[in-house]
């Protein structure tokens, strides 16, 4: 656990021509505030994607009124650091977005109005515990100068805040298998994460997942006493009074307090001291109210009905998020079918279709039967994103436009002769056979295998296949 800290040094016009107009005027006084959003890794994420490492909002800066005729100077800044607490390891590489917001203080109906003045973003490598890093970023005609660092919250140390340190329990040396905690030489590195259930008082580990017992204790979790020897040496059994060993994992390990809360151990458990704006057992509940102006982009703040939501931001069209901080990307609705590329143009959604597809949502397969005519009485059959024509007798080809020789497939059985006919084919059957394809033998008694010949046809007559 630790805290990312951001110090804004200046925000004003960048060098070069085209200095920006002051964002404030005598008629519209305003003040600035900043928002920082952190994401792990070096991913080039969209500004609206979640701030997985955390986010923070500065206080409002002093009210500023432009002096008529004067160029925009560096604008007055809010006091203090922006702090983004992180609960887990510091990732070492991170992406940041820093937004400069203007709060207009004129006679706004319904309270002040907010607008985004500038947004800068970058990707950096940073070890926790290192010195302040300085940076300059430009956004259009504006320039932002700032410093940042990541620091671990005790008892965590190291470049990723993953090692834990404890004050020494013995004046001369650290406990078994534990090194001094550079740069805090008067502290000792805390035990590794031992096997689950390993006694924090009587066990320790030099490798993660093991449980090695101090003298006088035994068992897989070092919970079984061997003798009642008192704490005569640094390797003796630990007790609350003698304090011979670096204590094992305590209730505050890993800092269970969210949102920058500090943890203190109590006889039974732990207690979180929460920063302003948060409360709850683990500082997990935001105490921000509408008076703090938490809704961006003209969102309307309404007091929440319960502690879970001390306020709710009703966002104007085009914005979403608990603070209306995210521009709605309606493409996240996944409206385009068949691999179409979505474009949110603000006033409308557009789908750019892949070849072979069309329609506002790329839902039409251009190879399908929609609008496809099969000639000469053929019928269209869809399948597998393609289409084919099932042609009427006498026709073939992709669209049934080609005349087919219906006799080419030798359809007449038992030596019957095939004749092409305008409506299909006719089989003239050999003696002893009948049927449309001469498929039925005529029985010697004159009866056929069929229940009866169709009226008007004698067995052996040529049959037209319709």
């Amino acid at each position: 656990a630790g805290v990312f800290e951001l110090q804004i040094h200046s925000f004003g016009p960048g060098p070069g021509p085209g200095a920006p107009r002051s964002p404030c005027s005598a008629r519209l006084p305003c003040r600035l505030f900043f928002r920082v959003c952190l994401k792990p890794g070096l991913s080039e994420e969209a500004a609206e994607s979640p701030c997985a490492l955390g986010a923070a909002l500065s206080a409002r800066g002093p009210v500023y009124t432009e002096q008529p005729g004067a160029p925009a100077p560096d604008l007055p800044l809010p006091d203090g650091l922006l702090q983004v607490p992180f609960r887990d390891a510091w990732p070492g590489t991170f992406s940041f977005i820093i937004e400069t917001w203007r709060e207009e203080l004129g006679d706004q109906i319904g309270g002040p109005a907010w607008s985004l003045l500038a947004r800068v973003a970058g990707r950096r490598r940073l070890a926790a515990g290192g010195p302040w890093a300085r940076d300059i970023q430009r956004a259009g005609a504006w320039e932002l100068r700032f410093s940042y660092r990541a620091r671990c919250e005790p008892p965590a140390v190291g470049t990723a805040c993953t090692r834990l340190c404890r004050p020494r329990s013995a004046p001369s040396r650290c406990g078994p298998g534990l090194r001094p905690c550079a740069p805090l030489e008067d502290e000792c590195e805390a035990p590794l994460v031992c096997r689950a259930g390993c006694s924090p008082e009587h066990g320790f580990c030099e490798q993660p997942g093991e449980c090695r017992c101090l003298e006088g204790w035994t068992g897989p979790l070092c919970t079984v006493p061997v003798s009642t020897s008192s704490c005569l040496s640094p390797r003796g059994p630990s007790s609350a009074t003698t304090g011979c060993l670096v204590p094992g994992p305590g209730p505050c390990d890993g800092n269970p307090c969210a949102n920058g809360g500090s943890c203190s151990e109590t006889p039974r458990s732990f207690e979180c001291t929460c920063p302003r704006g948060f409360y709850g057992l683990r500082c997990e509940v935001s105490g921000v109210t509408c008076a703090d102006g938490p809704c961006f982009n003209g969102g309307l703040c309404v007091g929440g009905a319960d502690p879970d939501s001390a306020y709710i931001c009703h966002c104007p069209p085009g914005f979403q998020g608990s603070n209306c901080e995210k521009r709605v990307d309606r493409c996240s609705l996944q409206p385009c079918r068949n691999g179409g590329l979505c474009l949110d143009l603000g006033h409308a959604l557009r789908c750019r279709c892949r070849a072979g597809f069309a329609g506002p949502r790329c839902e039409h397969d251009l190879d399908d039967c929609a609008g496809r005519a099969c000639a000469n009485g053929g019928t269209c059959v869809e399948g597998g994103g393609a289409h084919r024509c099932s042609c009427a007798l006498g026709f073939g080809g992709r669209d049934c436009r080609e005349r087919a020789d219906p006799c080419a497939a030798r359809p007449c059985a038992h030596g019957g002769r095939c004749y092409a006919h305008f409506s299909g084919l006719v089989c003239a059957c050999a003696p002893g056979y009948m049927g449309a394809r001469c498929e039925f033998p005529v029985h010697p008694d004159g009866a056929s295998a069929l229940p009866a010949a169709p009226p008007g046809l004698r067995p052996g007559d040529p049959q037209r296949y319709l």
């Epitope: 994607s49 979640p50 996240s332 996944q334 079918r337 506002p360």
Partner: antibody, heavy 117, light 107 residues
Framework: QIQLVQSGPELKKPGETVKISCKAS????????MHWVKQAPGKGLKWMGW????????GYADDFKGRFAFSLETSASTAYLQINNLKNEDTATYFC??????????WGQGTSVTVSS | DIQMTQTTSSLSASLGDRVTISCRAS??????LNWYQQKPDGTVKLLIY???RLHSGVPSRFSGSGSGTDYSLTISNLELEDIATYFC?????????FGGGTKLEIK
């Protein structure tokens, strides 16, 4: 064929948490966003929001910010709706529905949640 | 938010009748108007999307029309299985909104 199958009815006490599942089959789960709709007893349909099944990013209607959370288990083609700190007014039937670019074209059968002390 | 109003909350008709259910939007929304059917057992089905397109598997006696702010669903030849509540929904502007529903009963 396309199907959305939701988990069974739930009876909860105020202050508790409920998690409803919606298992999709018959299509590629990550091609379509999943939406959630609430219907209080004897009332109409109310759209709660959606979750992008490719990125996992949710979007909530104003009345469903705070205690409501949409999530996914993509490997199981399943979407979830979790409601924390349940209140009596959360008593309703909740539907999941697939979006096809124009409309919610396939719906789950609904999950009834009753909150009562 | 766009408000969707179905002025008729319930409607009685005889089998074989031609039935029209109307829906009005508080502002124009580019034809992204859908109609859903909710059966007495609670199941919900899409009938018509994008104002007038028939969803697959829906009988052709259902049709939709309209533009701007006024839309309607028509059942040309009422059948017993059409007894249900019908909802309109706009899918153009977030948040999506539904009409209050029109319950269709047999005389």
């Amino acid at each position: 064929q396309i199907q959305l199958v939701q988990s069974g009815p739930e009876l909860k006490k105020p202050g508790e948490t409920v998690k409803i599942s919606c298992k999709a089959s018959g299509y590629t789960f990550t091609d379509h966003s999943m939406h959630w709709v609430k219907q209080a007893p004897g009332k109409g349909l109310k759209w709660m929001g959606w979750i992008n099944t490719e990125t996992g990013e949710p979007g909530y209607a104003d009345d469903f910010k705070g205690r409501f959370a949409f999530s996914l288990e993509t490997s199981a083609s399943t979407a979830y709706l979790q409601i924390n700190n349940l209140k009596n007014e959360d008593t309703a039937t909740y539907f999941c529905a697939r979006y096809d670019g124009y409309a919610m074209d396939y719906w789950g059968q609904g999950t009834s949640v009753t909150v009562s002390s | 938010d766009i408000q969707m109003t179905q002025t008729t909350s319930s409607l009685s008709a005889s089998l074989g009748d031609r039935v029209t259910i109307s829906c009005r939007a508080s502002q124009d929304h580019s034809n992204y108007l859908n109609w859903y059917q909710q059966k007495p057992d609670g199941t919900v089905k899409l009938l018509i999307y994008y104002t007038s397109r028939l969803h697959s598997g829906v009988p052709s006696r259902f049709s939709g029309s309209g533009s701007g702010t006024d839309y309607s669903l028509t059942i040309s030849n009422l059948e017993l299985e059409d007894i249900a509540t019908y909802f309109c929904q706009q899918g153009d502007m977030l948040p999506w909104t539904f009409g209050g529903g029109t319950k269709l009963e047999i005389k």
